[in-house]
């Protein structure tokens, strides 16, 4: 960068190289240059020449100020005119950044997603810094007193196999950087406690024409845990409010789940669990469409959801897509 | 200018307790853990623990734990160490320096020389 | 604990040549490493934090570099100056602990 150039002289910003976005500072530049006593001093801002708000303060020095500065980043320079040579003298170049201190870390959230092999640590770091924030991810055992610190710039992946104190955690955020520093409250956790089992997944569906036709929904989850509790939701494509029905799963053999829907509409499906009893929910599913027929029996497979327009199918599924108006992963 | 302004040399007795300041300016004092390191003559540095001004949580390596007590005052920007039972075997220099996750230790205090001698 | 084992302990250069510092750390540290100076009588000083990233203020002839449990610590054309004990310090379980230091002797 620029701060890497041979300088003849020197150039300071006031307060900091790196201050609060929207604060008034001043950039000095003191030459320093062999057999020459600058006409002038010039600055220059990402290469471009300032023409306003230059000072000189003595034979050698010159200040420009700026009033509310908002850029994130400059590279400022500045050179020196002098006697009998044609060319302008770079003096020296410096780096300068705005931004702000970071909040205070907050909503943080930590997951093991069964058979990841980690615990996934989350939180919210509130407004934008603009500036290098650090953040380190304090993991405090409750049995040892032994302090982890995970340095990260977003989330964290923690293997549990380093998770040696124990089952009972401590864990706090601290968020820095050249402005100020903020912790979070402290997460007490509990590893049994935190463990969100295998995606379930919406494998096929059928609609049987029954006297009041039917429609079975197929559904699967890998995982190990014994007692699960699952949620499924679905609605119209056409309608803004989805149906919940909730179920206890015991995930031995694939779930089959009974919905009486109207005739010829498209619907949407997701599923999600938890460990029952337990805080946190798995992400919804991604979105399953089954459109039930006007009379016909009709099977909807998870291997016809992707683009099957021109199949000759009677059912034309969309690929997964966005047409929930919550499909956050509810984790809290 | 940062500054980490230690309190003087102690000469205690065995048995006794000490307790050494450790004085900060030229930053924001709750931004930064205050860390404690004993260095013994001729030896490397050893970790105390680290105070956080902002909340008072505390870290401390298990060998310090029951010989040392972190505090800090914050309207006079002043972190403490008091050490207690002490014996030959804690005669060293104690050092105070400020870190957080975006600096690190990044200045340190003069030190304070503690001498245990009957 | 993690134990940092430094090497080599003494280290004896003339100027102008470029030397290594090797910390070795017992288990995987995730650059979670900090490297210092200390002089005769003085207060250890921060040259690089978090394995290689560089300090306002030290002369960029200390660069450090390294990860998972391998780090070193370069001085590029050493100056007579650069005399002292060098420390590393690992930041990522606690207890932190340091190195037992690497003397450096100028010639």
């Known amino acids: 960068g620029i701060t890497n150039i041979n300088c003849s002289g020197h150039i300071w910003v006031e307060p900091a190289t790196i201050f609060k976005m929207g604060m008034n500072i001043s950039i000095y530049c003191q030459a320093a240059i062999k057999n020459c006593q600058p006409r002038k001093l010039h600055f220059y801002k990402n290469g471009i020449k300032e023409r306003f708000q230059i000072t000189r303060i003595n034979k050698t020095t010159a200040r420009l100020w700026y009033k509310n500065f908002l850029e994130p980043h400059a590279s400022m320079y500045c050179t020196a005119e002098c006697p009998k040579h044609f060319q302008e003298t770079l003096i020296c170049g410096k780096d300068i950044s705005s931004g702000y201190p970071p909040d205070i870390p907050d909503e943080v959230t930590c997951v093991i997603y069964e058979y990841s092999g980690n615990m996934t640590c989350t939180w919210n770091a509130g407004k934008l810094t603009y500036i290098d924030t650090k953040y380190v991810v304090h993991v405090k055992s409750l049995e040892t007193e032994e302090e982890q610190q995970y340095l990260t710039s977003s989330y964290i992946n923690i293997s549990t196999d380093s998770l040696q104190g124990g089952k009972k955690y401590l864990v706090w955020v601290q968020a820095a950087n050249a402005l100020g520093m903020e912790e979070s409250k402290q997460l007490q956790i509990h590893l049994d406690d935190i463990v969100i089992p295998s995606a379930a997944v919406i494998s096929r569906a059928e609609t049987i024409n029954a006297t009041v036709p039917k429609t079975i929904i197929y559904w699967d989850s890998q995982t190990t845990i014994e007692k699960v509790s699952c949620e499924m939701r679905y609605k119209a494509t056409t309608n803004q409010t989805w149906n919940v029905k909730e179920f206890d799963t015991n995930f031995t053999y694939v779930q089959q789940s009974e919905f009486y829907l109207e005739p010829n509409i498209k619907y949407v499906f997701q599923v999600r669990c938890q460990e029952t009893g337990k805080r946190y929910w798995q992400p919804w599913s991604s979105l399953f469409f089954h459109k039930t027929p006007e009379t016909v029996p009709q099977v909807t497979s998870k291997a016809f959801q992707h683009d099957t327009w021109n199949s000759g199918l009677t059912v034309a599924s969309i690929s997964t897509g966005h047409l929930t108006s919550d499909n956050r992963g509810d984790i809290g | 200018e940062v500054q980490l302004q230690q309190s003087g040399p102690e000469l205690v007795k065995p048995g006794a307790s000490v307790k050494m300041s450790c004085k900060a300016s030229?930053?924001?004092?709750?931004?930064?853990?205050m860390n404690w390191m004993k260095q013994s003559h001729g030896k490397s540095l050893e970790w105390i623990g680290y105070i956080s001004p902002k909340n008072g949580r505390t870290g401390y390596n298990q060998k310090f734990k029951g010989k040392a007590t972190l505090t800090v005052d914050k309207s006079s920007t002043t972190a403490y160490m008091e050490l207690r039972s002490l014996t030959s075997e804690d005669s060293a220099v104690y050092y105070c320096a400020k870190s957080n996750g975006y600096y690190a230790l990044d200045y340190w205090g003069q030190g304070t020389t503690v001498t245990v001698s009957s | 604990d993690i134990v940092l084992t430094q090497s080599p302990a003494t280290l004896c250069v003339t100027p102008g040549e470029t030397v290594s510092l090797s910390c070795r750390a017992s288990q995987n540290i995730y650059k979670n490493l900090h490297w210092f100076q200390q002089k005769s009588h003085r207060s250890p000083r921060l040259l690089i934090k978090y394995a290689s990233d560089s300090i306002s203020g030290i002369p960029s002839r200390f660069t450090g570099s390294g990860s998972g449990t391998d780090y070193t610590l370069s001085i590029n054309s050493v100056k007579p100056e650069d005399e002292g004990i060098y420390y590393c310090?690992?930041?990522?379980?606690?207890?932190?602990?340091f190195g037992g230091g690497t003397k450096l002797e100028i010639k």
């Open positions: 310090l690992q930041g990522y379980s606690t207890p932190w602990t």
């Open positions: 030229g930053y924001t004092f709750t931004d930064y853990y």
